[in-house]
């Protein structure tokens, strides 16, 4: 279920969820809705200062790089 993740614990969780894609602490510019709560809100604010779930963590994964055709 949802839990609070801070510090190295949060980084570990992001690395586990995002894998080789990597992750952002802030969502990239233009990510998702244009009426986000606040431009500076990032994964720390969303998951350390209140509980968050896997889906929330996944929102901060870097996009998959398209694989080149052989």
């Amino acid at each position: 279920g949802p839990e609070t993740l801070c510090g190295a614990e949060l980084v570990d969780a992001l690395q586990f969820v995002c894998g080789p894609r990597g992750f952002y602490f802030n969502k990239p510019t233009g990510y998702g809705s244009s009426i986000r709560r606040a431009p500076q809100t990032g994964i720390v604010d969303e998951c350390c200062f209140r509980s968050c779930d896997l889906r929330r963590l996944e929102m901060y994964c870097a996009p998959l790089k398209p694989t080149k055709a052989a």
Partner: antibody, heavy 119, light 112 residues
């Protein structure tokens, strides 16, 4: 057990830059979130900002244009710089730590550094 | 004016129960952000008293308890003791400000 110690000049002239350092002992600077808070004489606590060693920072909007926080992992220290200070910046400045075991609560504090802005 | 509102002062006699409230809004406490409480004695650094709305760090007596409902949070102290006389601050995160916020603080006076 993580311990914090603030250091820096106790007197800063108006329009100059206030610089403080927080030395961390008993823990790695790369494991936690770090924060600065201040308290003007006889008044309440004001959050200045916090950051993670990776470079993630978040500053109080009212101070953002004047604040810089940085970290020196080799010395296990982090610092605060506040530019263009005025008498209103006179306060006790605290560094604090969010270890992650307290749901974002600042569970370790330095003893505080008194900074007076005066010519 | 603080984003989180606290009464400036509260008082009680030894042995009594006192409550300190912290009123926020939909962008902080009401948005699900955790509330933390700090105790500060004159001339010393604040100390974390309650974290995550209702949890006590080790070493904090169970006379201290925290709760949260809607856009408000409360700190209750039962069996009031002289050594509880201090300033108490609530703290949370505010999404509209993108940062942490403190209440203005409540000075607790133990009578007698």
């Amino acid at each position: 057990q993580v311990q914090l110690q603030e250091s820096g000049p106790g007197l800063v002239k108006p329009s100059e830059t206030l610089s403080l350092t927080c030395t961390v002992s008993g823990g790695s600077i790369s494991s936690y979130y770090w924060s600065w808070i201040r308290q003007p004489p006889g008044r309440g606590l004001e959050w200045i900002g916090y950051f993670f060693y990776s470079g993630y920072t978040n500053y109080n909007p009212s101070l953002k244009s004047r604040v810089t926080m940085s970290v020196d992992t080799s010395k296990n220290q982090f610092s605060l710089k506040l530019s263009s200070v005025t008498a209103a910046d006179t306060a006790v400045y605290y560094c604090a730590c969010i270890t992650g075991t307290t749901k974002g609560g600042m569970d370790v504090w330095g003893q505080g550094a008194t900074v007076t802005v005066s010519s | 004016q603080s984003v989180l509102t606290q009464a400036p002062s509260v008082s009680g006699a030894p042995g009594q129960r006192v409550t300190i409230s912290c009123t926020g809004r939909s962008s902080n406490i009401g948005a699900g952000y955790d509330v933390h409480w700090y105790q500060q004695f004159p001339g010393t650094a604040p100390k974390l008293l309650i974290y995550g709305n209702s949890n006590r760090p080790s070493g904090v007596p169970d006379r201290f308890s925290g709760s949260k409902s809607g856009t408000s949070a409360s700190l209750a102290i039962t069996g009031l003791q002289a050594e509880d006389e201090a300033d108490y601050y609530c703290q949370s995160y505010d999404s509209s400000l993108s940062g942490s916020v403190f209440g203005g603080g409540t000075k607790l006076t133990v009578l007698g």
